[in-house]
């Protein structure tokens, strides 16, 4: 899987919108790694 | 409102460095990478490479390795590219850009700044 | 690195024109595309990610296709508003490239 820093974001994107926004406040590009994927 | 704020063009010597900054506000700045990217005239955009403002790890286009340092201040949710050792091929409008989900999913992009390199 | 080649390098079409842009890969990035349109002495402006998915607020006639190494942008009704160059870039592997970009004029 891809995991330059834009996948990564796009990533969280989806997850993100997929859960509907209710995870906790650093899961963020930044703080996380393409293994949380 | 989400803003990446560019430093002012620059004129330099071949053989100078240049640092360019970029502050951002209205959103988390440690939260996404920040991208560099340049424009020379008539030339395709070309990209230079990214830091994660979190850790301050960069991933760099080795095209620029070695001349190029990119660095944050987090206090002051600031980004700085540095070019060193400037030739003119280096004359091009640099660009930072920091693809965002919260505020808004979106690519926001710098107004970009001039740099100038001529003897 | 990945080599983007965009076609064609300028094009000329009348408001109303069905527009379409291409962007070529040198080998396979997945979805991993965007596409930014560019108005003149202005900064790029992001369309499209993940060859496909309209960012809010871009217009619904700006569509993106394809995976692999063949990408299309597509703007189905031409406006005078369009007028700018169009660039397609690949994020599936550092360094990032764009296509050398896509100059659109209106007839």
């Known amino acids: 899987a891809c995991d330059t820093a834009t996948c990564v974001t796009h990533r969280l994107a989806g997850l993100l919108s997929r859960s509907g926004g209710v995870v906790k406040n650093n899961f963020v590009p930044t703080n996380v790694g393409s293994k949380a994927f | 409102e989400v803003q990446l704020v560019q430093s002012g063009a620059e004129v330099k010597k071949p053989g100078a460095s240049v640092k360019v900054s970029c502050k951002a506000s209205g959103y988390t700045f440690t939260d996404y990478y920040m991208n560099w990217v340049r424009q020379a005239p008539g030339q395709r955009l070309e990209w230079i490479g990214v830091?994660?403002?979190?850790?301050?790890?960069?991933t760099y286009n080795r095209k620029f390795k070695g001349r190029a340092t990119l660095t944050v201040d987090k206090s002051a949710s600031t980004a700085y590219m540095e070019l060193s050792s400037l030739r003119s091929e280096d004359t091009a409008v640099y660009y930072c850009a920091s693809l965002l989900i919260r505020p808004h999913y979106f690519d926001y992009w710098g107004q970009g700044t001039t740099v100038t390199v001529s003897s | 690195d990945i080599q983007m080649t965009q076609s064609p390098s300028s094009l000329s079409a009348s408001v109303g024109d069905r527009v379409t842009i291409t962007c070529k890969a040198s080998q396979n990035v997945g979805t991993n595309v965007a596409w930014y349109q560019q108005k003149p002495g202005k900064s790029p402006k992001a369309l499209i990610y993940s060859a496909s998915y309209r960012y809010s607020g871009v217009p619904s006639r700006f569509s993106g296709s394809g995976s692999g190494t063949d990408f299309t942008l597509t703007i189905s009704s031409l406006q005078p508003e369009d007028v700018a160059t169009y660039h397609c870039?690949?994020?599936?592997?550092?360094?990032?490239?764009f296509g050398q970009g896509t100059k659109l004029e209106i007839k």
């Open positions: 830091i994660n403002p979190y850790s301050g790890r960069t």
């Open positions: 870039q690949q994020y599936n592997f550092y360094p990032y490239t």
